[in-house]
């Protein structure tokens, strides 16, 4: 089957929320973990990682399609040290399958905002931090 | 279970210097941002400085800018507060903390070290 | 820089007695976090993002508040409460700051 990873951020307020969705059919959840690393350029695992989900096989989902599974991490007041290059990452225990997204950064400014690269084009954000706003 | 041990505290005329050690152990150290937090005798607390996970950035309040520097050894799950040009109003118990990634609270604190700053 | 201003300074509370500690702040900010120390000892994560129980806190506590506004209540005073309590925000450039404390005290 086809499995992938896509990383995507949202605010709500002053809170940032960091999504990492894996997509993957559902006999394929088991064994699974989705994992979000800060500035790890190689050694991204669930180990080394600031949260982690181990995903399950949910029986209540009918039919062999694509499903998806969110790990979110959410931050209630981004500040100057949360700074850094993250990465979602996945792998199966069973399969011996990795996944690693594209790494995305979150940059505080001299001026107190923040943005957030590296997502895709539509999901570049730019936050006005005291506002909690989309700038 | 999470420790932070710190260490280096002491008796030192102004003008002199005293490094800090924070040992840490229980969770994953390079993971997160550090931070000193200081209390005068009978007094309150008073953030002094803090340092980020991965790239190691630094902030500091004003008045230890310039004297005071924190850093950080992964490999030993350590952290530091060099201080310098210690003044009579820095002396004070410095607690070594954690910052917690998700909110902005303090949410680990060492015993604290004693630094007194005389003549 | 935003400053913290607890009121009261000291208090003295009855077994039972319900307890309000107020913390306002020169500005408007997003969350107020609280933390209890005991005399001698270090200062404990208490209340964190104005209402939110940090773990082992006993469900007496309380806090709430926004804007200038926050504070932290206990409805039944035990003598295990008896500490200085501390309110503590973020903010940019000042980033962490500290109210001065309350003091409170068994009757």
């Known amino acids: 089957g086809c499995i992938n990873i896509t990383s995507s951020a949202s605010q709500e307020g002053t809170r940032l929320n960091l999504i990492c969705t894996v997509w993957h059919k559902k006999e394929e959840a088991e064994g699974f973990v989705v994992f979000l690393c800060k500035d790890r350029s190689g050694d991204c695992s669930p180990e080394t990682s600031l949260k982690q989900l181990r995903l399950k096989r949910d029986p209540g989902i009918d039919g062999v399609g694509e499903i998806s599974s969110q790990l979110m991490f959410t931050i209630s007041q981004v500040t100057p040290l949360h700074s850094g290059t993250y990465q979602c990452c996945a792998r199966s225990q069973k399969s011996g399958i990795r996944l690693q997204g594209h790494f995305f950064s979150i940059l505080f400014t001299e001026t107190g905002n923040y943005t957030v690269t590296g997502l895709k084009q539509r999901q570049h954000l730019e936050f006005s931090h005291n506002e909690g706003t989309l700038s | 279970e999470v420790q932070l041990v710190e260490s280096g505290g002491g008796f030192v005329q102004p003008g002199g210097s005293l490094k800090l050690s924070c040992a840490a152990s229980g969770f994953t150290f390079s993971n997160y941002g550090m931070a000193w937090v200081r209390q005068a005798p009978k007094k309150g607390l008073e953030w002094v400085a803090s340092i980020s996970s991965g790239r190691g950035n630094t902030y500091y309040r004003d008045s230890v800018k310039g004297r005071f520097t924190i850093s950080r050894d992964n490999a030993k799950n350590t952290q530091y507060l060099q201080m310098d040009s210690l003044r009579s109003e820095d002396t004070a118990t410095y607690y070594c903390?954690?910052?917690?990634?998700?909110?902005?609270?303090?949410?680990?604190w060492g015993q604290g070290v004693m630094v007194t700053v005389s003549s | 820089e935003i400053v913290l201003t607890q009121s009261p300074t000291t208090m003295t509370a009855s077994p039972g007695e319900k307890v309000t500690i107020i913390c306002r702040a020169s500005s408007s900010v997003s969350y107020m976090h609280w933390y209890q120390q005991k005399p001698g000892a270090s200062p404990k994560p208490w209340i964190y993002e104005t209402s939110k129980l940090a773990s082992g806190v006993p469900d007496r506590f309380s806090g709430s508040g926004s804007g200038t506004s926050y504070s932290l209540t206990f409805n039944n005073m035990e003598a295990e409460d008896a500490a200085t309590y501390y309110c503590?925000?973020?903010?940019?450039?000042?980033?962490?700051?500290f109210g001065a404390g309350t003091k409170l005290e068994l009757k």
């Open positions: 903390v954690t910052h917690n990634y998700e909110s902005t609270i303090f949410d680990y």
């Open positions: 503590q925000q973020w903010n940019y450039p000042s980033m962490y700051t």
